[in-house]
């Protein structure tokens, strides 16, 4: 806390500018004007305060704002954003997208920092969804930003949303994670035909349900065997021979190679050897 | 430097209890999504359970109403008690930590025998 201080003659700042950084603490707290200082908070980030004047200045601001930023302060807060806690950023309003990427900016690189965490958490509970170009935003900034989110939290993301996902955005996901994002693009991508929407849907398969592995089987998709291994096992069993030949098309030799793994091997075991022979791989039941 | 580290394996009677630990550091177990995952000899790796960053957790079908996940941010450490073991619940135990970056990380492992 800095103490109340008349501000000597003449230091009064008329503006934000690089000779403040020869301002001692108590000289920053008795000469710059909050109000002063909210109007031109995009000109902080280009002068080289250290940490303990940046801590004047963030006091400042919570005077003049003990509610809370506006948002056209936040905007520009630059590397003072770091020094601000959850709490503090509980207490804003951001809606605008590029408020957030400007703060992401910031902390590009890092780890989600707890600040981090609950500025997403306002702006997407601010918004009421997980939109197409917030998912988009997030996910350029945390690729594994989707996979953090538990199923409760996916169930609040539109299936227009899905068209902003990339297959890498998946990688971390577990199965139920998948379970609720797959019905979610099985209807962002119904439009499409057959290659074209399989080659979306591909990523999502890990919560497709057994039904819909049959469909794909009469579409010539020719899934290769990294997608197949990732099926829920339960949806894999019912399949026929003559479905899981049709799904993978030439890649049903890589069964093979498979055969004591999950869910080939249970597979496997369901069948009647007959059927097995058919496809001339020396699968054994 | 992140380091995973898991205790808490053993052999059990079916139908016996287990806890499981993974200590976590180098990561906060509170900004990531962490995951148990288990490996039975000649099998993949499947998912157990998580706890997402938002304190909330999923089960595989397998282990619901039986295995329980929980952390202690103070710890840096989270649990799985297992309950009502079975055989079939016999694996090498694995925790994952995986980051919003898309970073993930595991443990070395622990070992759960359930003898009938």
């Known amino acids: 806390e800095v103490e109340k201080t008349a501000c000597p003659s003449g230091k009064k700042a008329r503006e934000i500018d690089e000779s403040l950084i020869f301002y001692k603490k108590w000289e920053l707290e008795a000469c710059v004007d909050a109000a002063l200082l909210a109007t031109q908070m995009d000109r902080v980030n280009a002068i080289p305060f250290t940490y303990e004047q940046l801590d004047v200045l963030k006091h400042k601001l919570d005077e003049l704002y003990p509610q809370g930023y506006p948002e056209s302060v936040i905007q520009h807060l630059g590397y003072l954003f770091l020094k601000m806690s959850p709490e503090d950023i509980r207490k804003w309003n951001v809606t605008s997208l590029e408020t957030l990427k400007a703060l992401l900016e910031v902390n590009k690189g890092h780890e989600m920092s707890p600040q981090v965490a609950t500025l997403i958490d306002r702006f997407v509970k601010g918004r009421g969804q997980l939109d197409k170009d917030t998912l988009d935003t997030l996910t350029a900034f945390y690729p594994g930003y989707l996979c953090s989110l538990s199923p409760e939290e996916l169930s609040s993301v539109p299936p227009s949303s899905i068209w902003a996902v990339r297959p890498q955005d998946l990688d971390t996901c577990d199965p139920r994670q998948l379970d609720v994002l797959y019905p979610k693009a099985r209807l962002a991508f119904q439009n499409m035909n057959g290659s074209e929407y399989f080659v979306k849907i591909q990523s999502f398969l890990g919560g497709a349900p057994t039904e819909d592995l049959k469909a794909l089987s009469q579409q010539n998709v020719s899934m290769d065997l990294a997608t197949f291994m990732k099926l829920r096992t339960d949806a894999v069993l019912p399949l026929t021979v003559a479905e899981v030949q049709k799904l993978l098309g030439p890649h049903v030799e890589g069964l093979k190679a498979e055969e004591r793994h999950r869910p080939v091997r249970d597979w496997i075991l369901r069948q009647r050897q007959d059927d097995l022979d058919t496809l001339g791989l020396g699968l054994q039941g | 430097q992140v380091h995973l580290v898991e205790s808490g394996g053993g052999s059990v009677q079916a139908g016996g209890s287990l806890r499981l630990s993974c200590a976590a550091s180098?990561?906060?177990?509170?900004?990531?999504?962490m995951r148990w995952y288990r490996q039975a000899p000649g099998n993949e790796r499947e998912f157990v359970s998580a706890?997402?960053?938002?304190?909330?957790?999923s089960y595989a079908d397998s282990v619901r109403g039986r295995f329980t996940i929980s952390r202690d941010s103070a710890l840096n450490t989270v649990f799985l008690q297992m309950s009502g073991l079975k055989p079939e619940d016999t694996a090498t135990y694995y925790c994952?930590?995986?980051?919003?970056?898309?970073?993930?990380?595991w443990g070395q492992g622990t070992q759960v025998t359930v003898s009938s």
């Open positions: 706890m997402y960053r938002s304190g909330s957790t």
């Open positions: 180098g990561v906060s177990v509170v900004n990531f999504a």
């Open positions: 994952q930590a995986t980051s919003p970056m898309g970073d993930t990380y």
